[in-house]
């Protein structure tokens, strides 16, 4: 059965997933899909790294973590109910059927009704005053110049402080980690 | 293996729009990466345009954000550069680059050199 | 922006020499930093990335070091295949680039 992992709605949801590289920098291919793990690959493809880097990507969807040292966990930004669901981490590991494949159920519940707003800090995963917004076709990147200058240096550090520090306790429990090589 | 070669005139003049195709080898633009615009001026330095995700999102060089806009032709695995309002500091050998989600790049085209002047 | 300054613009070395070329970022950047050799007339090659995890297919006598504001790229032993002119390159925020490195023969 899956592990469970919660977050509220419009905060980063945190979905823990680690593996040992045999040496430092030499990744192996990991994938994050939407839906249990199938067979092969990852199923709705959220997020994809190979060798080298993350080579696939979608909104809200980034690795927080040191990916070169194995830390793949996934942060979902800014999260809605229709992020709930079981999600894919898929270590490639090279041979055949050699995958490690971890199903993650997330549920997300609403937001508590709060007296009085509390100050949010944003930020935006892209470049400086880069903000990606959707719509029905292609993503399109708009400039806006009253965002604040945040780096992807410090997009880690606000990611390591919005991170449910809970969460990091169920993951060691859960044994969502294997050691390749 | 993948390949980028660009193509486009070689010439244009002041005030004019100057458009570059890059067209990709060996790999859909769609499966993923971000497909980035870099030019090298006749002193050698480098500057980073832009780029079109393998999603269509953008992200464009703020002191060029006014100026560029960079598209894909997916039926033809192509993405393109248009850079408004040139001057003849714009002249500059072009190259089109394939790059990670943190744009560096591995893959480079040999580079198309534009010169603008009247 | 963040600024990149590279240093020294250009040296002269011998083959067999081992070579050091810094480069200094004017903010934080974390280790995302990438290096390029580029020769003339040809598109620049991918080094480094990451700081210090070699491309695949770069010899191991090119290594690179650093995080924070100070990198460094090195060549163990200069062969003649390597006089070139090497950039530095940051992508922490919006990527920039160093002046580069030309490395002549002595």
């Known amino acids: 059965s899956e592990v469970e992992y919660r977050a509220e709605v419009g905060q980063n949801a945190y979905l823990p997933c680690f593996y040992t590289p045999a040496a430092p920098g030499n990744l192996v291919p990991v994938c994050w899909g939407k839906g249990a793990c199938p067979v092969f690959e990852c199923g709705n493809v959220v997020l994809r790294t190979d060798e080298r880097d993350v080579n696939y990507w979608t909104s809200r969807y980034w690795l927080n973590g040191d990916f070169r040292k194995g830390d793949v966990s996934l942060t979902i930004e800014n999260v809605t109910l229709a992020d709930s669901g079981i999600y894919c981490c898929r270590i490639q590991i090279p041979g055949i059927m050699n995958d490690e494949k971890f199903n993650l159920k997330l549920v997300i519940k609403p937001a508590k009704v709060t007296p009085a707003p509390t100050r949010q800090r944003d930020f935006t995963a892209a470049f400086p005053r880069m903000l990606t917004t959707r719509g029905h076709g292609p993503a399109e990147t708009q400039t806006l110049g009253s965002l604040p200058d945040i780096n992807l240096t410090q997009i880690s550090t606000l990611a390591n402080e919005l991170r449910d520090s809970r969460l990091a306790n169920d993951l060691r429990d859960s044994g969502a980690t294997i050691r390749i090589g | 293996q993948v390949q980028l070669q660009e193509s486009g005139p070689g010439l244009v003049k002041p005030s004019q729009t100057l458009s570059l195709t890059c067209t990709v080898s060996?790999?859909?633009?769609?499966?993923?990466?971000?497909w980035n615009w870099i030019r090298q001026f006749p002193g050698n330095g480098l500057e980073w345009m832009g780029y079109?995700?393998?999603?269509?999102?953008?992200s464009y060089n703020p002191s060029l954000k006014s100026r560029v806009t960079i598209s894909v032709d997916t039926s033809k695995n192509q993405f393109s550069l248009k850079l408004s309002s040139v001057t003849a500091a714009d002249t500059a050998v072009y190259y089109c680059?394939?790059?990670?989600?943190?744009?560096?790049?591995?893959?480079w085209g040999q580079g198309t050199t534009v010169t603008v002047s009247s | 922006d963040i600024q990149m300054t590279q240093s020294p613009s250009s040296l002269s070395a011998s083959v067999g020499d081992r070579v050091t070329i810094t480069c200094k970022a004017s903010?934080?950047?974390?280790?995302?930093v990438a290096w390029y050799q580029q020769k003339p007339g040809k598109a620049p090659k991918s080094l480094i990335y990451?700081?210090?995890y070699r491309y695949s297919g770069v010899p191991s006598r090119f290594s690179g070091s650093g995080s924070g504001t100070d990198f460094t790229l090195t060549i163990s032993s200069l062969q003649p295949e390597d006089f070139a002119t090497y950039y530095c390159?940051?992508?922490?925020?919006?990527?920039?680039f160093g002046g580069g490195t030309k490395v002549e023969i002595k």
């Open positions: 990451s700081a210090s």
């Open positions: 390159q940051q992508y922490n925020s919006y990527p920039t």
């Open positions: 060996g790999y859909s633009i769609t499966s993923g990466f971000a």
């Open positions: 079109i995700s393998h999603s269509g999102s953008t």
């Open positions: 680059a394939r790059g990670y989600r943190s744009p560096w790049f591995a893959y």
């Open positions: 903010q934080n950047v974390g280790a995302n």
